[in-house]
């Protein structure tokens, strides 16, 4: 039961995380105009990975896409790439994990295969989360660098009559969404990897014997030897005598003729 719960929770957490990564990638507020100590501004600028926007005090908002590819900063391109890789890996991970879920039966899929798929999706989620965290962190670092550079040059032409105020940008909501989402995807991935260990016990290969203390007769569980997954420390073929005691997870893990739909 614990394995199913861990796997299910890992899947849900990863699903929320990937949805968050997608949301963060699409959001326009990666960087927002620093308002200093002034909460009300006549013209408010904010930028995303794909377009920049201006919101006026009149309520009018205008957004312009970055229609150039070569003219964009390399760092922005790198952030875009990291976020897209994170989304793609996460999406594949979700697809794989759906089939790996213990509560879903697909044909005669064995536990070893489910364990492998759970591990694969877990690793994918971990890499996806790391990609998102890396992408957001790179962008945040870029903002911090630019912020202090523009602070140093806050006013140009101070010697003359004319002043030009440089627009400073600070962290937008998308960065926090991205960090949280990346973290959730990472946690979900770790949970999937933990669940994988439970799905593939140390002694995976068995010829199960069901013992009943009440009588002399011994019922043999059909199924023969199972292929080794390699997750256990002992990969030799052994007969497992379980004395009639089984956990709910173990009961679920033995395929029988009743499993096929």
């Amino acid at each position: 039961m614990a394995v199913t719960a861990c796997q299910g929770l890992g899947f849900v957490v990863s699903l929320i995380g990937i949805a968050g990564i997608i949301a963060a990638t699409c959001m326009d507020q990666w960087s927002t105009q620093d308002l200093y100590n002034n909460p009300v501004t006549a013209v408010f600028n904010y930028q995303g990975l794909w377009r920049s926007c201006v919101r006026e005090s009149s309520g009018f908002t205008e957004c312009r896409g970055y229609f150039t590819l070569l003219g964009l900063p390399a760092m922005l391109q790198a952030v875009r790439a990291l976020m897209i890789v994170g989304i793609v890996l996460g999406a594949i991970g979700l697809l794989v994990s759906i089939f790996a879920l213990k509560c879903i039966r697909i044909g005669s899929m064995e536990d070893s295969a489910k364990a492998n798929m759970t591990l694969t999706s877990g690793i994918m989620f971990i890499v996806s989360g790391l990609c998102a965290i890396a992408g957001v962190s790179v962008f945040a670092n870029m903002l911090v660098t630019n912020f202090w550079m523009s602070t140093a040059n806050m006013y140009t032409g101070m010697g003359g009559m004319v002043q030009t105020v440089q627009t400073r940008y600070t962290f937008g909501a998308a960065l926090f969404v991205g960090w949280v989402a990346g973290g959730l995807t990472l946690i979900g991935g770790v949970m999937m990897c933990i669940a994988c260990r439970g799905l593939a016990p140390e002694e995976t290969n068995y010829k199960a014997v069901s013992y009943h203390a009440s009588g002399h007769s011994v019922a043999y569980k059909p199924g023969g030897f199972k292929a080794s997954t390699g997750f256990g420390s002992n990969t030799k073929n052994k007969k497992i005598y379980d004395g009639g005691a089984r956990t709910e997870d173990e009961v679920q893990s033995y395929p029988s003729k009743h499993d096929y739909v």
Partner: antibody, heavy 115, light 113 residues
């Protein structure tokens, strides 16, 4: 079509108070009060976000004037306290539009501060 | 606060003349986010409310005749009336629409010669 109709102007003694109203019909996201002293130029007084009620004022009017709105009546207000002779002017309400320009104006209401 | 300085304060012109009014701001009105200058021009006739002519320094408000045009960027802006018409005799104001507090120029009165 947006229509703005001001009211509430009149004669008031120095140190007195007055509340101007601007009845708004049509879509407005944000509104302004602008005044014009006799024979002088335009002077921006205050701005308000009609949805959040968030205001901002010109430095000369902070603390004395309060801009507000009533959602149910779709009305804009300017509460003026501690009035001085130099506050004598025609007060206009105006709607903010693209480029933060003021595209619709009321007809104006005259406020005279005199003893 | 941004100071707006208009010149000339008044001018005399005849119908058909080309008229240019300049406006200078103490700070750039160009917004880096959309590369637009937040300068607005108004026309006001005696006893009437002002009328919006131009926003974003050069965008003509709907219903405004095409003889009116605006130009400029940064701190220097101009309003041009290509061929002055009888109804154009009025006072013209420029306005900083870039940052609060919004500030107006002192106005330019266009009179009949």
């Amino acid at each position: 079509e947006v229509q703005l109709v001001e009211s509430g102007g009149g004669l008031v003694q120095p140190g007195g108070s007055l509340r101007l109203s601007c009845a708004v019909s049509g879509y407005t996201f944000s509104m302004n009060w602008v005044r014009q002293a006799p024979g002088k130029g335009l002077e921006w007084v205050a701005w308000i976000n009609m949805y959040t009620g968030e205001p901002t004022y010109a430095d000369d009017f902070k603390g004395r004037f309060t801009i507000s709105r009533d959602d149910s009546k779709n009305t804009l207000y300017l509460q003026m306290n501690s009035l001085r002779a130099e506050d004598t002017a025609v007060y206009y309400c105006a709607r903010s539009s693209m480029g933060n320009g003021f595209d619709y104006w009321g007809q104006g209401t005259l406020v005279t501060v005199s003893s | 606060d941004i100071q707006m300085t208009q010149s000339p304060s008044s001018l005399s012109a005849s119908v058909g003349d080309r008229v240019t009014i300049t406006c200078k701001s103490s700070q750039s009105l160009l917004n880096s986010g959309n590369q637009k200058s937040y300068l607005t021009w108004y026309q006001q006739k005696p006893g009437k409310a002002p009328k919006l002519l131009i926003y974003w320094a050069s965008t003509l408000e709907s219903g405004v005749p095409s003889r009116f045009s605006g130009s400029g960027s940064g701190t220097d802006y101009t309003l041009t009336i290509s061929s002055l018409q009888p109804e154009d005799f009025a006072t013209y104001y420029c306005q900083n629409a870039y940052s609060f507090p919004f500030t107006f120029g002192q106005g330019t009165k266009v009179e009949i010669k």
